[in-house]
């Protein structure tokens, strides 16, 4: 990316991190920023299976505000699909039309999954929505594969990985896995007392990891999936961020951002300890330690701010 960005900007940091995470296409979606603009991304999503959009490959733009992730992105479809208007910002709870429902923990990946998830739903006259007939949508799905984007040079046939056959889990499972992996449940504190938040470690979460595939029990004609929890493992865990494509295909800025994040990761333990049950006596001690740590962290931030204010002449790219 030739344009110079302020690497201290939360939006720039976050977008570079997301660009690295989404660098490799999946069989269902892909998104990357334009060469010359980190705040405009182009994405490609596969139409959801078992729907009128099955077989379709749809392309669009994501325009991110400077305040991202505090404010939502705007999403514009560029491929005719029969569900969303082409060239118009679409109205979803994860898009710029609904800033009140947007959550900063959501991401571009969340937006892509939402687009896929909402495609088969009824538009109900929402802004930017269409209600074409199933036949029209199927025809557009077929036609969508021939689309080529002038803006980013993507040809739909080559953008996504081929669909896995047979073992490919259902759309609901993929959504569930992404949702579970992506949303930070709780900031964890590692052994050194440093809080690891979602901004530090995208895939850290305090979850019980049950099996990825548990057989569905069918009761008569009702597909009712119910799971007991007795035998689950109790440890919280840290899932490392996804490997990124070789440095050669990254800009120097992206490479530096990646190296910094890797350095940051290498200083934290591999396993984030789950919250162990404690008695009331140790709770007070823990609280006191936490207060001291937070006070020190606050003091460090204040000194850093003063230092940066005085030493602004050294404000160059790392």
């Amino acid at each position: 990316m030739e344009t110079r960005y302020n690497l201290k900007s939360p939006a720039v940091k976050r977008l570079m991190k997301e660009a690295a995470e989404l660098k490799d296409p999946t069989d269902h979606y892909h998104a990357q920023p334009l060469e010359d603009n980190l705040f405009e991304w182009h994405f490609t999503v596969r139409g959801p299976p078992d729907s009128d959009f099955d077989g379709g490959v749809y392309h669009g733009r994501i325009v991110l505000p400077p305040e991202y992730p505090m404010k939502p992105p705007s999403i514009i479809l560029l491929t005719a699909n029969g569900r969303f208007e082409v060239g118009k910002k679409i109205c979803l709870s994860i898009s710029g039309h609904h800033p009140e429902t947007w959550q900063p923990s959501w991401s571009i990946r969340t937006a892509l999954l939402a687009i896929i998830g909402f495609m088969p739903t009824k538009g109900e006259g929402a802004i930017g929505s269409l209600d074409y007939t199933p036949e029209e949508r199927r025809a557009l799905a077929k036609k969508s594969q021939d689309f080529c984007c002038e803006g980013c040079g993507s040809a739909m046939k080559d953008v996504l990985l081929p669909l896995k056959s047979g073992s490919d889990s259902s759309q609901a499972d993929q959504e569930a896995k992404e949702l579970a992996r992506q949303i930070s449940f709780k900031a964890e504190v590692n052994s050194s007392g440093k809080t690891i938040s979602e901004s530090d470690l995208n895939h850290s979460f305090s979850l019980t990891d049950l099996q990825d595939d548990i057989p569905t029990t069918f009761q008569g004609a009702t597909a009712s999936t119910s799971y007991g929890l007795q035998n689950s493992s109790a440890a919280s865990f840290h899932q490392p961020t996804q490997p990124v494509a070789k440095n050669t295909s990254m800009s120097p800025r992206q490479r530096r951002a990646q190296q910094q994040s890797q350095r940051r990761l290498s200083t934290s333990p591999d396993v984030i300890q789950g919250h162990q049950p404690r008695d009331n006596h140790t709770d007070h001690g823990g609280s006191a330690v936490l207060i001291v740590i937070l006070t020190l962290a606050l003091a460090a931030l204040i000194f850093r701010r003063i230092y940066l204010a005085n030493e602004y002449i050294f404000d160059f790219e790392l």
Partner: nanobody, 111 residues
Amino acid sequence: QVQLQESGGGLVQPGGSLRLSCAASGFVFENSAMAWYRQAPGKERELIAVIGTTFIKLAESVKGRFTISRDNAKSTVYLQMNNLKPEDTAVYYCSKSGAYWGQGTQVTVSS
């Protein structure tokens, strides 16, 4: 239009049980991940359970006490809550894919 309607909340004593239901409409239910979130007073909304077709994950805080299940024929997702604690007091929200939300149902655990 996507609609999610939670029910089953209420006042319960510590150690008691509740079963929350979420009736969904306006989308292809079986193709969608469903989730339960909760928000305690003065705290951030927290994701506690996610269910796909054959996939489930639960937050550590509810492990061994809560189960999530779905009935595709009824387009309904459930949250069975056992051995409730005062700290489980919150408004519980049902969600489609973490993007559409219900209005929430209040759960209060108190003696």
